[in-house]
């Protein structure tokens, strides 16, 4: 039968029956940094070119024994789990090692290092079709570490790293952190995070998705003909490069941010008991499991989108977070969160001639993060429209005023310290949709963006009395832009958007009482664009699965900013 | 990429016109900056990566990997090149003191100095 | 749950031979390798070498080399081990181990419960 | 083959007490080293794997530090149940090795 963890990455709706993707990734290329492999194990023989690249430090200890199975075995597992002939996520795919690992499973970070600039000359000598670099190793947070990494995955190539396995945050780890890395954390066949002893997966803001890494049966370096079960984030992240190659395979012209969302949607949602995560972590870690698209095309109509949060703003009065989306993504709305409650709102503002996403801590708190609503969006045009804070009762309120462009997210942000939470809250009057409205001391952001066949509404959920979470989620076909609270009181922890749906949290029930002060409305709103959707439909009486990108070609730019953190 | 573990003493007197003083200090404001991995057992010190500001030259890396070598030389200090980085990042991986770190960070077209550490696989 | 279970005690003459079954269940039995390790009475524990299930590949502790015979039945998720030309001082309980690879560390995480085997004339 | 030699081979304590329990390599295994615990007539228990990772289910009064050729199994406070036998094994290189063990008695 089919091993669990390809069963897992399957679409589900092949499940039934035994559903075997075809020999895909046979246009990528993966590159594998690790241990020395067995190239001649039946597995992967014939699949895998071994590089003469090795920089590694000396084994532990002067007279170290040398086993070839040993010395090979994590490299082996992984080289199987992202191509092997039986046990491969993308049988098609060729793969080249270089050895950065020794025999202990031990590099360094300058070996690492030499080993992306290996691979970034050997792309500029003979360039090839899509390159997958798969880092599953890790060590603590390295500047230069991330650099290199942004630097090869801004000459296109996709990098997908472990987590790591410290039952940590992520964002304290190199490669992990960087956020240009695909960051893959590992789950069982429970869909559970994977534990060992006090370790286990790491988890937080710079992990993008999860993969199976639990009793992975993969090639074993003992023999040609071995298999054996291995566990880890590698193994996670080697299934999420096998994915990407497969996906790549499909449509060649991808974009690593075009490649991430899809990686995104096509996840299983909330699958994962977040219990197991420390409480602080729990919101900030994307509940993804990652998936085969269930077919190679059809996901150029979608409009994706996904959640970015910004490192902890820290404690301090003036302390600010800030939340960014890659080059080639729009900042479609920008909310901010708060565990004490205690938060000045957020803003949408230019930076580097692109927009990002501020928040901005208050008196008293403990500090804030910055949410970020990233969204591919081709030949767009967004701004941001600012109003001050009102002098009338009715509260501050801001519209799309220039034709043709619509509302997809809506931000508050004020000076004073605490809005109260004695003024009532403020209504939408009927029939203008296209308006961000808040309290009258915040000044409010209304993000206004053009884009072909872009149209989008306002969806709200209001629940008079006082309640911890309140959510509103988008129909099927249409995808969540904008997330934010009416009116923003302090009892308001803040505004997310998770997958689909937008989540308001509130102070404890029992801290606000049950008067109609307590009264939240969850905001959304909900786009779809037509123009893909139709460029979409035209594509399909072709056979070819490539060209559906060039929809996405109008908007590439360079990922010159080093920022925070995605998910 | 060749071994910069050469003859110490010719360096110097090949060299010896530069001043100890900085002939192309860096440019106001701009201070270079040390980092080093936050896990300790992981730290490998006496191996340092220099990162050069982003638009240098491979042949000015090679200058300020030069120059750091003479200036160290002259104070007693071996240190060895052990690659020069071009293609991903501008600068150099050096073996050498710890004791030179304030003199590194202080040549040219620097732009910060890590560490090295362990990664491990995972 | 994980589990190996092995057959029972034996008793044997010196230069005879013993085959020892180990029986695995709650888990793919060709994910993991095989070990087995000896105990002498009221001595440590000295291990004697491995089998891969999923192929035949073996791997002796050089000591017993010449004398030790792994093999696997996958059907029946059964892992074998014999010992021939049996010497007083083979007298142990033999342990069958299972061998679990998580990131870069190797453990043994499932223990059978030991078959004592006694060479005596 | 690797030497594990381990330090002391018995030692009485009493429940609350801290136990210390040493074993050294004969080269450097790294931090290639699990230890187990074994109870008569039972088979051994996996405690620490690669020298300081408690295992699932351990309780946090076993930890394990050490690297290169100098390893330590700690009981931060005896309890009942923990009179025993503890072993140290590297899996550096073949052939794995354990150490002679150490048995843990009441006083």
């Known amino acids: 039968s089919i091993p669990w963890n390809l069963e897992r990455i399957t679409p589900p709706r092949y499940r039934a029956d035994e559903y075997q993707p075809p020999d895909g990734g046979s246009l990528v290329e993966v590159y594998l940094l690790d241990t020395s492999i067995q190239s001649d194990h039946r597995e992967i023989e014939g699949r895998v070119m071994v590089t003469d690249f090795e920089n590694v430090p000396e084994e532990d200890g002067t007279r170290f024994h040398r086993q070839a199975s040993k010395c090979d075995s994590h490299g082996t597992h992984l080289a199987g789990v992202v191509s092997g002939r039986d046990a491969g996520v993308a049988k098609g795919a060729s793969m080249r090692s270089l050895r950065v690992l020794n025999c202990q499973g031990k590099g360094t970070v300058s070996g690492t290092l030499i080993g992306l600039e290996f691979i970034r000359k050997s792309q500029l000598v003979q360039p090839v079709g899509p390159l997958v670099v798969l880092l599953p190793l890790a060590g603590g947070y390295s500047r230069v570490l991330n650099a290199a990494c942004q630097r090869l995955a801004r000459a296109g190539v996709v990098l997908v790293t472990a987590a790591g396995n410290f039952r940590d945050d992520a964002c304290l780890y190199s490669p992990a952190s960087a956020p240009e890395v695909i960051t893959v954390g590992a789950t069982n066949a429970q869909d559970q995070p994977v534990t060992l002893g006090t370790l286990g997966t790491n988890f937080g803001r710079c992990v993008d998705l999860f993969a199976p890494g639990e009793d992975i049966i993969g090639a074993s370096s003992d023999c040609s003909t071995c298999f054996v079960s291995q566990s880890g984030t590698s193994q996670a992240a080697a299934h999420v490069a096998g994915i990407a190659a497969m996906m790549l395979s499909a449509e060649p012209e991808l974009t690593l941010a075009e490649l991430r969302q899809r990686l995104i949607h096509f996840s299983a949602k909330d699958v994962i008991n977040e219990a197991w995560f420390p409480e602080d972590q729990r919101v900030l870690t994307p509940n993804l499991v990652a998936a085969l698209p269930p077919s190679t095309h059809g996901a150029g109509w979608q409009l994706f989108c996904r959640t970015v949060w910004s490192a902890h703003s820290g404690p301090t009065r003036m302390a600010t977070a800030v939340a960014r989306c890659a080059p080639d993504e729009e900042l479609l709305s920008c909310s901010s969160f708060s565990r004490s409650g205690k938060r000045r709102g957020e803003r949408m503002e230019a930076q580097g001639g692109k927009l990002v996403c501020r928040a901005h801590n208050a008196f008293g708190g403990e500090g804030v993060y910055a949410i970020a609503r990233c969204c591919l969006l081709p030949q767009a045009n967004c701004s941001v429209h600012t109003a001050p804070p009102a002098e009338a009762s009715m509260g501050t309120r801001v519209h799309c005023h220039q034709q043709g462009h619509v509302l997809t997210g809506c931000s508050s942000h004020w000076e004073v310290e605490d809005l109260g939470t004695h003024k009532p809250p403020v209504l939408r009057p009927r029939g203008q949709p296209n308006q961000c409205v808040g309290h009258r001391e915040a000044s409010i952001h209304a993000s206004c963006c053009h884009a072909p066949g872009l149209e989008c509404k306002v969806k709200e959920h209001g629940i008079p009395a006082p309640q911890e979470q309140v959510t509103v989620a988008c129909e099927e076909g249409w995808t969540l832009t904008g997330c934010s609270a009416l009116p923003g009181t302090s009892h308001v922890l803040g505004a997310y958007a998770v997958d689909n749906t937008c989540v308001v949290r509130s102070r404890d029930v029992s801290t606000t009482g049950s008067t109609s002060e307590g009264a939240v409305t969850a905001v959304a709103i909900c786009c779809r664009s037509r123009h893909l959707a139709q460029a979409s439909q035209e594509l399909q009486g072709s056979t070819s699965g490539s060209g559906l990108n060039d929809i996405f070609e109008a908007q590439k730019i360079e990922w010159h900013e080093h920022h925070h953190h995605h998910h | 990429q060749e071994d910069e573990d050469g003859d110490y003493e010719e360096l110097v007197l090949a060299l010896r016109s530069e001043e100890d003083g900085l002939a192309e200090a860096p440019e106001h404001g701009t201070t270079a900056t040390f980092h080093r991995c936050a896990k300790d057992p992981w730290r490998l010190p006496g191996t340092y990566v220099v990162v050069l500001k982003e638009e240098t030259h491979l042949s000015q890396s090679e200058r300020t990997a030069r120059r750091l070598q003479a200036q160290a030389a002259r104070r007693g200090y071996l240190t060895k090149i052990l690659h020069v980085f071009h293609g991903l990042l501008p600068g150099f991986l050096v073996k050498m003191s710890g004791d030179l770190l304030e003199l590194a960070l202080k040549l040219p077209h620097v732009d910060y100095i890590e560490e090295d550490s362990s990664v491990f696989a995972q | 749950q994980v589990q190996l279970v092995q057959s029972g005690a034996e008793v044997k003459k010196p230069g005879a031979s013993v085959k020892v079954s180990c029986k695995a269940s709650g888990y793919t039995f060709t994910g993991y390798t095989i070990h087995w390790v000896r105990q002498a009475p009221g001595q440590g524990l000295e291990w004697m070498g491995y089998i891969n299930p999923s192929s035949t590949y073996t791997k002796f502790n050089q000591k017993f080399k010449d004398r030790v015979t792994m093999t696997r039945d996958t059907s029946i998720s059964t892992a074998y081990m014999e010992l021939s030309r049996l010497r007083s001082d083979d007298t142990a309980v033999y342990y069958c181990?299972?061998?679990?690879?998580?990131?870069?560390?190797?453990?043994?995480?499932?223990w059978g419960q030991g078959t004592t085997v006694t060479v005596s004339s | 083959d690797i030497v594990m030699t381990q330090s002391p081979s018995s030692l009485s304590a009493s429940v609350g007490d801290r136990v210390t329990i040493t074993c050294k390599a004969s080269q450097n295994v790294y931090t290639a080293v699990d230890w187990y615990q074994q109870k008569p007539g039972k088979s051994p228990k996996l405690l620490i794997y690669s020298a300081s990772n408690r295992y699932t289910g351990v309780p946090s009064r076993f930890s394990g530090s050490g690297s290169g050729t100098d390893f330590t199994l700690t009981i931060s406070s005896l309890q009942p149940e923990d009179f025993a036998t503890y072993f140290c094994?590297?899996?550096?290189?073949?052939?794995?090795?354990f150490g002679g063990g150490t048995k843990v008695e009441i006083k």
């Open positions: 094994q590297q899996y550096s290189s073949y052939p794995y090795t």
């Open positions: 181990a299972r061998e679990r690879i998580y990131s870069n560390y190797w453990f043994f995480d499932v």
